[in-house]
């Protein structure tokens, strides 16, 4: 028998989403206008390509990366697209209100779209921990809260700690990971009897997840360099990210084989670990002076990722109810922390080199920045989790977790589609 949306959600979701969309359209109408000063059309196209790379990463990369569940692949891809589309709209407005609004209208530039796409990417990283256990109405709430929290975090960090766009956006890895994990912690955990098969991966969805990983792998240098100020910084970021992800692929595949008693390679490990270098190198990608350092970082990140994928899922599954294949959350939390630690080391070296007696102060500031990102992620994540538990959202019953048939109309009703 085909599973239907509960009647109340069938009324609630379109009403909730379309009302929100109408509100966003009104906000855009009253408060925004385009940057009218674009003189150079060739330059415009070149600048747009960076945004295009980010959109490909978000829609195809993260969309397909989370689609490895046997019975939840459609929902993973489409819900990701839905969240991206909504998240970008709200992020553009929010960023404009927080940074430009006192001067009048919010000016929309390609740069603001770039920032918004990256903010929305945060939600797509976080949602990996809860996908399959929530419906679209709940995901709308998650998008709104997370984009708002990240926008405010970036504003606070920018004003208090004087960090540039790149540095305060690179907290996205740690922020998104901890946000997602704390939301997952709030949601009902036990998978009832008979649903265990649904959170298992299947060959075709796993292949599409690998496709997602490949897209992310190809475009990660664009992500790490998108917000950098000068061509030399972007060049360094692209090169260092490329070296790091290249090494993490080799490490992921060989490490995965090493971790298996029969020397077999785990798809789940590879999906996530191929990206490890890109995450770990993110914060300092433009500062690393030579390729070998980026490669070492990629190697360490790959090993941490494979190690984490081997030993953490049991714990995460028990405590947070996160399925074995959703390893992005704890992966990004570990690798994001590694990246932040690398940056703090660079900061210490810099301060010592300058003969500045303020080493402790600088390190304290950086640790404060990181701590603030984690605290805001955890607090806003817990708030979101509590909101998602409200009855009004008509969350899927636990027996319907990881089931496309709850959300999609299929021409056939075969269970093993």
């Amino acid at each position: 028998m085909s599973s239907k949306y509960p009647r109340s959600v069938r009324r609630c979701l379109p009403l909730w989403a379309l009302t929100l969309e109408a509100a966003l359209i009104l906000l855009f109408y009253f408060f925004t206008h385009y940057d009218a000063s674009l003189e150079d059309q060739k330059g415009l196209v070149a600048s747009y390509q960076v945004g295009q790379d980010l959109t490909v990463m978000a829609a195809i990369g993260l969309g397909f990366l989370t689609s490895s569940f046997r019975r939840h692949s459609w929902s993973s891809v489409a819900f990701n697209l839905f969240m991206l589309a909504l998240g970008v709209q709200w992020a553009i407005l929010l960023d404009g209100f927080l940074s430009q609004f006192p001067s009048g209208k919010v000016v929309i530039t390609l740069f603001s779209i770039r920032l918004a796409t990256m903010s929305a990417l945060s939600v797509l990283i976080s949602v990996d921990a809860v996908l399959g256990k929530v419906n679209l109405a709940q995901l709308v709430v998650m998008v709104l809260v997370e984009v708002t929290a990240l926008g405010n975090l970036r504003m606070v960090i920018s004003n208090i700690f004087n960090t540039d766009y790149h540095m305060n956006m690179m907290h996205i890895y740690v922020f998104a990971a901890y946000f997602g994990l704390s939301v997952a912690w709030c949601l009902p955990k036990p998978l009832p009897e008979g649903t265990e098969d649904k959170d298992q991966t299947a060959t075709i969805p796993s292949l599409s997840a690998m496709l997602g990983a490949l897209f992310l792998w190809m475009f990660w240098p664009s992500f790490n360099s998108a917000l950098l100020r000068s061509p030399i910084e972007r060049k360094n970021a692209v090169f260092n990210t490329y070296y790091a992800v290249a090494v993490s692929v080799v490490t992921a595949i060989s490490g995965s084989s090493l971790a298996h008693p029969q020397g077999k390679i785990s798809k789940t490990y590879v999906h996530s670990a191929v990206l490890a270098g890109g995450v770990a190198v993110g914060t300092s990608c433009h500062l690393i002076p030579s390729p070998w350092l980026a490669m070492v970082l990629g190697l360490v990140a790959g090993l941490i990722s494979v190690g984490g994928a081997k030993y953490l899922p049991g714990c995460c599954n028990r405590v947070l109810g996160i399925p074995h294949s959703s390893i992005m959350g704890y992966n990004f939390s570990l690798l994001g922390l590694l990246g932040e630690i690398i940056y703090i080391v660079l900061l210490v070296l810099d301060t010592v080199g300058a003969g500045n007696g303020m080493i402790g102060f600088q390190v304290l500031l950086s640790i404060g920045e990181l701590s603030l990102a984690i605290v805001i992620a955890l607090m806003s994540g817990l708030l979101t989790g509590l909101l998602l538990n409200l009855k009004i959202w008509k969350a899927p019953h636990e027996a319907k977790y990881f089931d496309d048939q709850v959300f999609w109309k299929f021409p056939h009703l075969a269970v093993g589609f």
């Epitope: 415009l44 100020r229 002076p289 810099d350």
Partner: antibody, heavy 125, light 105 residues
């Protein structure tokens, strides 16, 4: 050699508009961030606006936000400053300047290494 | 806020001159020094607090980090009489000091 040449200055009434241009030569214009800095008569230097090398990001001092717009045309090696709703306090010599980046260990350091000769803007009724 | 001292300074050719610049917050080494002569554009002397711009005579030197910075001219030459500005690029908006006018005694 590396040169920046401003033009477009003049006398304008309060509330009027003016568009300044800065033509670059002797270097790869599209690879550098650019700035406008002004100096009121008998006063010090005041930073006004910046634009990234690819034109994707811009920033302004609070006193000109919403009135001034910085832009660039990399195909013409030209930087612009569109000034609207001009006030008496906008009277100054306007300089364009090139931004250079130096890699530090934990952050890049930016500075203005090449300046134009300046163009004078007078806002008076 | 960048505060320069002194506001003006009289010195003779051959003197050693020191101009100081104080930042209202820690700006690490994100400081530049410029020289401006009447009717001309500013000229970069020192960047990153202590690095000498190419083409600038070695009698100019910069030092400091954090909040206190100094520009030193070891042996004053006739062409050095001008106004000197410090400028921070640590946080937006970039700000300049009010300037120090160096005059002939």
């Amino acid at each position: 050699q590396v040169k920046l040449l401003e033009s477009g200055g003049g006398v304008v009434q309060p509330g009027g508009s003016l568009r300044l241009s800065c033509v670059a030569s002797g270097f790869t214009f599209r690879s550098y961030g650019m700035h406008w800095v002004r100096q009121a008569p008998g006063k010090g230097l005041e930073w006004v606006a910046f634009i990234w090398f690819d034109g994707s990001n811009k920033g302004y001092v609070d006193s000109v936000k919403g009135r001034f717009t910085i832009s660039r045309d990399n195909s013409k090696n030209t930087l612009y400053l569109q000034m609207k709703s001009l006030r008496a306090e906008d009277t100054a010599v306007y300089y364009c300047a090139r931004e250079k980046a130096l890699r530090g260990i934990s952050r890049y350091n930016y500075y203005l290494d090449v300046w134009g000769k300046g163009t004078t803007v007078t806002v008076s009724s | 806020v960048m505060t320069q001292s002194p506001f003006s300074l009289s010195a003779s050719v051959g003197d050693r001159v020191t101009i100081t610049c104080r930042a209202s917050q820690n700006i690490r080494s994100f400081l530049s020094w410029y020289q401006q002569k009447p009717g001309t554009a500013p000229k970069l002397l020192i960047y990153a607090a202590s690095r000498l711009q190419s083409g600038v005579p070695s009698r100019f030197s910069g030092s400091g980090s954090g909040t206190d910075f100094t520009l030193t001219i070891s042996t004053l030459q006739p062409e050095d009489f001008a106004t000197y500005y410090c400028q921070q690029s640590y946080s937006a908006p970039w700000t300049f000091g009010q300037g120090t006018k160096l005059e002939i005694k």
